[in-house]
Interface confidence: low
């Protein structure tokens, strides 16, 4: 993905159809790459990223990566193609309309990642276990 400050031109209404025949078009995602964060021990956090980018490719989705080590906490927000691994992990939840953080095993740090497919969905990252596919609010967003 080309970062937003490098993009020269975009097509923000292009269509891609997935295997189920669902039609999609370039996502609007928060795209601040890696920034220091104060998000810690919360059910959900806002990205505090002021840059919204139209993803370069229609198939790309929004991604957020939260990392904590002994020194700092960072939050990464990008567009990424779910067919390709990110930080060596598959984007399993790319079809979700909300960014529900899932912990991944990384030595020496706490590592959470989420991906989602609604405009700017990586602006609100959710750690709470309450958010799953049985949540009626989530179903409302998916099927409205």
């Amino acid at each position: 993905t080309i970062p937003p400050h490098v993009q020269k031109s975009v097509n923000n209404d292009m269509i891609v159809t997935d295997n189920n025949g669902a039609v999609k078009f370039p996502q609007l995602c928060k795209f601040c790459d890696v920034r220091f964060s104060t998000c810690d021990n919360q059910k959900s956090c806002m990205s505090n990223c002021s840059i919204t980018s139209i993803c370069e490719k229609p198939q790309e989705v929004c991604v957020a990566v939260w990392r904590k080590n002994d020194e700092n906490i960072t939050l990464e927000t990008v567009c990424h193609d779910p067919k390709l691994p990110y930080h060596d992990f598959i984007l399993e939840d790319a079809a979700s309309p909300k960014c529900i953080m899932k912990e991944k095993k990384k030595p020496g740090e706490t590592f959470f990642m989420c991906s989602c497919s609604s405009d700017e969905c990586n602006d609100n990252i959710i750690f709470s276990e309450e958010y799953n596919t049985s949540n009626p609010d989530l179903l409302l967003v998916i099927f409205q």
Partner: antibody
Amino acid sequence: EVQLVESGGGLVQPGGSLRLSCAASGFTFDIYAMTWVRQAPGKGLEWVSVISGSGGTTYYADSVKGRFTISRDNSKNTLYLQMNSLRAEDTAVYYCARRGQYRDIVGATDYWGQGTLVTVSS
Amino acid sequence: DIQMTQSPSSLSASVGDRVTITCRASQSISSYLNWYQQKPGKAPKLLIYAASSLQSGVPSRFSGSGSGTDFTLTISSLQPEDFATYYCQQSYSTPPTFGQGTKVEIK
């Protein structure tokens, strides 16, 4: 039920200003990009502008760039179009419309308001 | 900008007729085409997206086809409520552009 209701249209002199509003209900407003489309009397449809769900990204048709400003207040579920330096050729019915999420349809407009008429004349 | 040209600009037909409207893009837009119906004094309504996908709630007598630069909207058996103006729109690139419209009138 998804509803979009425009207001703020009226008669204005060339060079004048007007602000249109679009009150949205029946859906989660802040996750949808919203658009304005206009239609001059007896003419076809012309796309005017689009704004992302958070309001962080906006795009404009060349014909209105630098004169019109699209914005939104997600706490009020309301979309706005501030129109400055109005010209006779801006006379049209202005529709606000929702840009569909990919699970539903293409980034075309799946729900439209009833429109509000803007007349620019001296 | 991509130019969209519809034909005919108007047509007269009777209830039960098969009606075909064509739309041509000035450059290839793959299948990135939508069709809208508009009745006098009303907002447009989405009928077909991605050239051939029927929008939810739209009667099956409406169908779309085509790819590249040439597209067709077909109404298999015209009903009284179908008399309206129809617009094609490309959603391949910004700005999304519309055809000039085809008015379907009662013969």
